[in-house]
Interface confidence: low
């Protein structure tokens, strides 16, 4: 670290005095201090001498000596006061520029440390400081306004009390610049606009920034529009608003509108689309298939997307049958608005019961008329099976009826022994019935099929099983011939003697 001679932190001299400051280091050294006249610099290897034989108040300041080759970057400093009774202040700069919330140093240096007790900061022409001005003073550096605000951009003077009267410095102009975080904030409303030809419309493009220096314009399909601008200042922000009013829109007015604002930080833009239509419209659609199949007991949400202008005057869900005259509960119907002209309507059908299969229609109305979208809901059921023994045309026949949805497939099994269900090891014969007879097949109902197995002689120590299956599940019925007739075994149920 370099060393300064005289080895004192502060030196007080009178005007006209000779001052010699010597700095010694291990390598070459350099002086740094306030720009002032009359100094002579003499360097000799590892030492440097700064001298004047006619010190003035302008030589007041802190002189720092550094050693450029020192990796630690050490330095030494001495503060020189040139105590001029006529000049209490040495002002190093007459204009100070800072950003808002930074500390602003007004560099008026006191030429006599004794005067420190009577210093103050004022605005020019003796005006007091603005309220909430928080400042401090250092005789070496001057006045510091802490966390300067834009409103504190003023002309200031430093005041010292000398012999009972206040002596002012020359003025220092403080410029506090707003911190511009980025391009202006933008809003363009509405985000989307639809109007019928001949209706009125309004599009508002507004931009705001902490700084007044920004531009904003509205453009239509890349053409800049000449719209008068309204300016305002509130909430510490400058606002510029462009309002486009159209009393009777036509198709030429349609298209893309962009609100663009720019400042030194860059450009922001936001867009909206304006659609002009010939007449009111109402479109219903669904991302779902209009024909729905759901397993009984499960839930289903039916969703309809509505695109409309003007807005809906009415809408509702209706059950069109065929099972009952019940109507969907309003609490199960839900509406959400995606944006101004698009809405989603949902009907929740939890734990579907057999009587809830059928047609569900969503109806909506606006000035363009009524529209409806109808869903067909069919319930899926696992097969239910029953077997009976009968004679058809004199032949003994096992008759299997299976009911379910989708239409069940039927398989007959013959196995040894008496059992509720044939397992692989017991199976003697298997017959697939590829075309069972359809007994009933009405919309929204189960499909009932019938399969016949002609048996010349019933083997008494055997079981005949009818199995039915579809995509939902399977069902079976075991028929056990006994000497007194025949026993049937519905799965996991009691024996039944017809």
């Amino acid at each position: 670290i370099p060393v300064i001679e005289p080895s004192v932190p502060e030196l007080v001299v009178k005007p006209g005095a000779t001052v010699t400051l010597r700095c010694v280091g291990n390598g070459s050294v350099e002086w740094d201090g306030p720009p002032s006249p009359h100094w002579t610099l003499y360097s000799d290897g590892s030492s440097s001498i700064l001298s004047t034989n006619n010190a003035t108040f302008q030589n007041t300041g802190t002189y720092r000596c550094t050693e450029p080759g020192d990796p630690l970057g050490g330095s030494a400093a001495i503060h020189l006061y040139v105590k001029d009774p006529a000049r209490p202040w040495n002002v190093l700069a007459q204009e100070v520029v800072v950003f808002e919330d930074q500390d602003a140093l007004l560099p008026c240096l006191l030429t006599d440390p004794v005067l420190e007790a009577g210093v103050s900061l004022v605005r020019v022409r003796g005006r007091p400081l603005m309220r909430h001005t928080n400042y401090s003073f250092s005789p070496w550096h001057g006045f510091t306004i802490h966390r300067a605000k834009f409103i504190q951009s003023q002309d200031y003077q430093c005041s010292a009390l000398m012999g009972g009267r206040k002596v002012m410095s020359i003025s220092i102009r403080l410029k506090v610049q707003k911190v511009i975080p980025g391009p202006p904030a933008l809003t363009l409303v509405p985000a989307e606009l639809v109007r019928i030809r001949g209706e009125a419309a309004q599009i508002v493009c507004s931009a705001s920034s902490v700084d007044v220096n920004f531009d904003v314009f509205l453009q239509h399909n890349n053409t800049k529009l000449a719209i008068p601008q309204q300016s305002d200042f509130h909430n510490n922000r400058y606002q510029k608003v462009l309002t486009l009013n159209l009393d009777q829109v036509d198709f030429q007015h349609a298209g893309n509108y962009s609100c663009v604002a720019s400042n030194v930080q860059g450009k922001h833009s936001t867009s909206m689309f304006f659609r002009v239509v010939e007449s009111a419209y109402l479109n219903l659609s669904s991302e779902q298939n209009l024909i729905q199949e759901v397993t009984v007991g499960e839930g289903l949400n039916l969703k309809v997307m509505v695109e409309a202008y003007p807005g809906l005057q009415g809408f509702n869900w209706t059950y069109l049958g065929p099972f009952s005259d019940h109507q969907p509960e309003p609490k199960l119907a839900n509406a959400t608005t995606k944006d101004t002209y698009r809405h989603t309507f949902t009907l929740s059908l939890p734990r579907l019961k057999p009587s809830e299969a059928g047609r569900y229609s969503f109806l909506a109305r606006n000035p363009g008329g009524w529209r409806a979208l109808t869903f067909e809901l069919t319930l899926r059921y696992p097969p239910e099976v029953s077997v009976i023994w009968t004679f058809i045309n004199g032949s003994g026949t096992l008759l299997c009826a299976a009911s379910g949805y989708p239409q069940p497939n039927v398989t007959w099994l013959q196995c040894s022994g008496h059992t509720d269900r044939c397992d692989e090891a017991q199976v003697l014969q298997v017959w697939d019935d590829p075309y069972p007879e359809v007994l009933s097949q009405e919309p929204f109902h189960k499909v009932t099929v019938q399969s016949l197995l002609t048996v010349e002689t019933l083997e008494h120590n055997q079981t005949y099983e009818c199995r039915a299956h579809n995509s939902v599940g399977s069902g079976s019925w075991a028929f056990i011939p006994i000497s007194a007739g025949a026993h049937t075994h519905p799965p996991d149920e009691f024996l039944f003697t017809p």
Epitope: H220, N221, T223, L225, A226, I227, P228, L244, N245, L246, D247, Q248, D250, Q252, H253
Partner: antibody, heavy 118, light 110 residues
Amino acid sequence: QVQLQESGPGLVKPSETLSLTCTVSGGSISSYYWSWIRQPPGKGLEWIGYIYYTGSTNYNPSLKSRVTISVDTSKNQFSLKLSSVTAADTAVYYCARGWWELTFFDYWGQGTLVTVSS
Amino acid sequence: QSVLTQPPSASGTPGQRVTISCSGSSSNIGSNYVYWYQQLPGTAPKLLISSNNQRPSGVPDRFSGSKSGTSASLAISGLRSEDEADYYCAAWDDSLSGVVFGGGTKLTVL
């Protein structure tokens, strides 16, 4: 349906001021640019200038020193004054509604012939 | 002398296709929309084409507009006797800060 109707003297003496008024009916004067356009006999169209309903104006540079366009929103009217006229200012004068693309004149008056002659 | 240049006359027979050109510069046609106006004899001009190629409602689709660089053109297909009129192109001029018109083209249907 918006309609525009020009009115004013059909004969003006040289060096005097030509004054015309355009009355807008069937629609508001607000939100549009209102222009004056003229057509000398047997010649093409020449744009004179426009006024926005707020009062801001823009004039053809070649006529700027002699033109004043004003607006009276309460009467739904706008007016043209052309000073120091000469025979070269003899023309059919049209008023027109311009949308804010400025060149988009969707409604025109039927035009009024102004002759400059002593 | 008009800022936009149009041929003074054009002609065609009924059913024909006729094109009218309009030439300008980078400060008008080059950077702004072109508009076309039709002026039937003894009447006020009527907007025919807006924004280079948009037809206002009521204008037949026989009329079409296009723009390329600093030039624009109006095409009329299936020419009819009622199309006989003067046609003017117009554009905003950035350097003059005003509307400029072409000198007009007189269309004759032979």
